[in-house]
Interface confidence: low
């Protein structure tokens, strides 16, 4: 299953499959997730070790048992791969690291005014993997405002150094934010030239293309089909790069297929998994297990559930079957691809779905890094769970926010439906940033069912929570994925990094905003909050947030939207924007429905609706 917990001051001993330098534990975890053999990782922050060579060391590990002995190491952080974690799986990493220089091959230098502009340049350069930016206070004047675009053989820094007034980060191409655009074409009977960065065996060109997309240095590929003239090169997928970023030449060649990485696609990337099943094909590799199952789909599910399994072959040979069940060979290899591919067999083969974003409905997101008064503009994919609840009567308008918590579920405030309980008038927009981008052609979800908390009463602040079941499930993308729910009765976690998002008013007497706003707001104790609202009862099922001096808050139109807090690299839905005295007033914090107090209700309603739990809090 999906394990998201991090172990502080702990280091996994043994099991090493790879090592690299990463700026933090979350990036290390992401590299582990995408490494075909990595199940566990250990990370050594700069503060945890004197040995300069091992600072920022990220150690990727494998284990036959799925675990390794932990040894105490002050400052070290260890954890699990996010394979099998569904929508948490993402190669997108937005963080900017201050006071850190990520070293690599510097291939481009330019002057820019901000680190954000530098990151944008990196994202818009086909070869840039990461960057460093010297701020205006850098000690050498001639280097100030320099933006260095970089790459390395493995896609991670060749070294990471602590350096004042330098800021570093990664390209946002894996966030589907590149302005470059991509070539979707597949070229039959054409071979590309240039440098091979890797070779793998794949059953078709589409798997080859996906592997190229997620390989740090692959820009284009050539695939040799199963009828290629040289037998030993059949099904070979050659991952390629070039200085210019495009093939310097191409040659007409029977039984070859070529194409490009899709990493530079805007707004949509292929999933990092291969779901197709290949009949009449055997995949060879190291045997992990053999089990009798009924049907190839069950074989694929079995492989997906066994975290070390990378691919499988389901045999239909008479000697491999008994009654209705046949042998399911669960296999793995060093690079995650079959070491052999044989055609014309009585088997069917395919891959584990452990890296599919859709994954299991029952896991929660960790991966993404409010109008809102005193807020700032959000960027694409920053809050992918945020939805806009709009009402279409004669005209259409935004009324409330909401949070995507499952493929078919949105959590919002009950008071959003005061006077408008009719499900037909509502339209739910997900995966959007600008309300002005919504046209009559923009896809939206319709409501199948509105479930208002049974104890909610109109014009009262208690139990201000509602669930929306969508008519059709949503697919997850970088811009549209769920937020993780907290543990039931979560009272022990001290949240210090909380944000409210929404399109609501920017002042008490204002208007709905076009760009999704965000604001960082500290939580306030219920005792402190009660002092500020003496005419109201602040219950344990509410949570308050705000600055003593005011100035930043949620406002009209933000209702129902999320109050999210980041803890141990994971975002959780702590509150639902509910009510407050005006907006951003001094000593008048915003009041939010405390989601942890309603976990039983949420799980009961989402389960009873279709007999299956649709989301789950982290363990």
């Amino acid at each position: 299953g999906c394990l998201t917990q991090l172990y502080e001051n702990a280091f996994f001993r043994g099991g090493d499959v790879a090592s690299m330098y990463t700026p933090n534990a979350q990036y290390c975890q992401m590299r582990c997730t995408f490494h075909p053999r990595c199940l566990l990782f250990s990370f050594l922050p700069a503060s945890s070790i004197n040995d300069m060579e091992k600072r920022f060391g990220c150690f990727l590990k494998d284990s036959v048992t799925g675990t390794l002995p932990k040894v105490h190491r002050t400052g070290a952080v260890s954890g699990h791969s996010l394979k099998q974690c569904g929508h948490q799986i993402s190669a997108c990493h937005r963080d900017i690291y201050k006071g850190v220089d990520m070293r690599g091959v510097n291939f481009n230098v330019s002057k820019v005014s901000s680190v954000e502009e530098c990151q944008k340049r990196c994202t818009s350069n086909i070869r840039c993997q990461f960057f460093s930016y010297a701020t205006q206070t850098f000690h050498k004047a001639e280097y100030r405002n320099n933006c260095l675009l970089k790459y390395s053989p493995g896609g991670t820094p060749t070294a990471i150094k602590v350096l004042s007034n330098v800021e570093s980060g990664f390209s946002l191409k894996p966030c589907a934010l590149s302005e470059i655009g991509c070539h979707m074409n597949i070229f039959q009977h054409l071979a590309f030239s240039d440098v091979d960065v890797a070779r793998v065996l794949t059953p078709d060109a589409f798997v080859c293309r996906t592997i190229c997309t997620y390989h740090p240095n692959c820009l284009f590929f050539t695939f040799y089909t199963n009828v290629w003239k040289i037998e030993s090169q059949r099904n070979v997928c050659l991952l390629k790069t070039s200085e210019s970023g495009t093939p310097s030449s191409s040659t007409p060649q029977e039984n070859t297929i070529s194409g490009y990485s899709l990493l530079t696609c805007k707004r949509t990337l292929p999933e990092p998994c291969h779901s197709k099943i290949y009949p009449g094909v055997d995949f060879g590799g190291e045997e992990l297990n053999v089990t009798f199952v009924k049907g190839v789909n069950v074989c694929q599910e079995t492989c997906t559930k066994m975290i070390r399994c990378q691919f499988f072959t389901y045999s239909l040979l008479p000697e491999d079957c008994k009654e209705e069940k046949c042998k399911c060979f669960l296999r793995l290899s060093m690079d995650g691809s079959p070491t052999r591919i044989a055609y014309g067999t009585q088997g069917s083969s395919g891959y584990s779905l452990r890296l599919c974003n859709t994954g299991d409905n029952s896991v929660c997101t960790t991966k993404t890094s409010t109008r809102i008064v005193g807020g700032t503009n959000s960027s694409w994919g920053e809050w992918p769970w945020q939805v806009s609840l709009q009402v279409k009567l004669t005209a259409q308008r935004h009324l409330c926010g909401g949070s995507l918590i499952g493929h078919q579920w949105v959590l919002t405030a009950a008071h959003c439906f005061d006077g408008l309980p009719l499900q037909d008038v509502w339209r739910i927009y997900s995966g959007i940033l600008n309300l002005s981008d919504i046209t009559k052609d923009t896809p939206f979800s319709q409501i199948k069912e509105i479930i208002i908390h049974q104890n909610y009463k109109v014009s009262e602040g208690n139990h201000d929570i509602a669930l929306i079941k969508l008519q059709a499930p949503l697919n997850y993308t970088e811009f549209q994925k769920p937020i993780c729910l907290p543990s039931k009765g979560d009272t022990s976690t001290i949240y210090t990094n909380c944000w409210v998002t929404g399109w609501g008013f920017s002042k008490e007497k204002g208007e709905i905003q076009n760009i999704l706003q965000k604001v960082n707001i500290p939580l306030v104790t219920n005792e402190e909050c009660q002092k500020r609202y003496q005419d109201y009862k602040i219950t344990q099922r509410m949570v308050c947030a705000g600055y003593k001096e005011g100035g930043k808050d949620a406002c009209k139109g933000d209702s129902g939207g999320p109050l999210v807090c980041k803890h141990n690299g994971m975002w959780r839905l702590v509150g639902i924007t509910s009510w407050g005295e005006g907006c951003a007033r001094r000593e008048q914090p915003g009041v939010y429905t405390k989601v942890a107090e309603y976990m039983d209700w949420i799980l009961e309603k989402t389960q009873s609706s279709d007999g299956k739990a649709q989301m789950q809090s982290p363990a």
Epitope: D16, A18, S232, G284, S315, E319, T339, R340, G344
Partner: antibody, heavy 120, light 107 residues
Framework: EVQLLESGGGLVQPGGSLRLSCAAS????????MHWVRQAPGKGLEWVSS????????LYADSVKGRFTISRDNSKNTLYLQMNSLRAEDTAMYYC?????????????WGQGTLVTVSS | DIQMTQSPSSLSASIGDRVTISCRAS??????LNWYQQHAGKAPKLLIR???SLETGVPPRFSGSGSGTDFTLTISSLQSDDFATYYC?????????FGQGTKLEIK
């Protein structure tokens, strides 16, 4: 010309240890999977162990799992086989072999072998 | 594991004869089959890979065929240097199973 030269064989008592080495030349060692194959006197060939190019991925025959360890030093173009808890049935000529392209399972080149005798 | 079975286990023939050696896999392995020749006291040598691809330097009198489970090594006209033991080996799995060998002797 590809050359593989095994060394380290000899007479050892049951329960003892030996470390075999295979010095490689004539090809880019770091790009190929390497294998150990053995042949008991008068018997057929038996695959023993394999190691992939980076050294991070190893495979063993069930008969030696937990007792033998394959490793490589790409900087020295050398393949190793550490053999512990040796048994009489491990007596054999041990060959090192270079795997095919793409870590292929065909054994392209073989050394002349080194003889391991386990006897009291 | 896949079992590889060679037949016959030994074979007597004369120079100039046409000889075929069979190898059967216990389950389908596509064309992932290799043939090796081993002279007494020497290291094995790869003759044929991928069921039918002749290695560079191997005389054309050697040929291989088959796919799936049944494979054949054929020597069209025996020469004195061909008297040796021949092994098939599957390379579909990562266990690299060998057949038990076929000893080709002079009649």
């Amino acid at each position: 010309e590809v050359q593989l030269l095994e060394s380290g064989g000899g007479l050892v008592q049951p329960g003892g240890s030996l470390r075999l080495s295979c010095a490689a030349s004539g090809f880019t060692f770091s790009q190929y999977a390497m294998h150990w194959v053995r042949q008991a006197p008068g018997k057929g060939l038996e695959w023993v162990s394999s190691i992939y190019p980076s050294g991070g991925f190893t495979l063993y025959a069930d008969s030696v799992k937990g007792r033998f360890t394959i490793s490589r030093d790409n900087s020295k173009n050398t393949l190793y086989l550490q053999m512990n808890s040796l048994r009489a049935e491990d007596t054999a000529m041990y060959y090192c072999a270079r795997g095919g392209w793409l870590a292929g399972g065909e054994l392209l080149n073989w050394g002349q072998g080194t003889l391991v005798t386990v006897s009291s | 594991d896949i079992q590889m079975t060679q037949s016959p286990s030994s074979l007597s023939a004369s120079i100039g004869d046409r000889v075929t050696i069979s190898c059967r896999a216990s389950r389908g392995i596509g064309t992932y089959l290799n043939w090796y020749q081993q002279h007494a006291g020497k290291a094995p040598k790869l003759l044929i890979r991928a069921a039918s691809s002749l290695e560079t330097g191997v005389p054309p009198r050697f040929s291989g065929s088959g796919s799936g489970t049944d494979f054949t090594l054929t020597i069209s006209s025996l020469q004195s240097d061909d008297f040796a033991t021949y092994y098939c080996q599957e390379s579909f799995t990562n266990v690299y199973n060998f057949g038990q060998g076929t000893k080709l002797e002079i009649k």
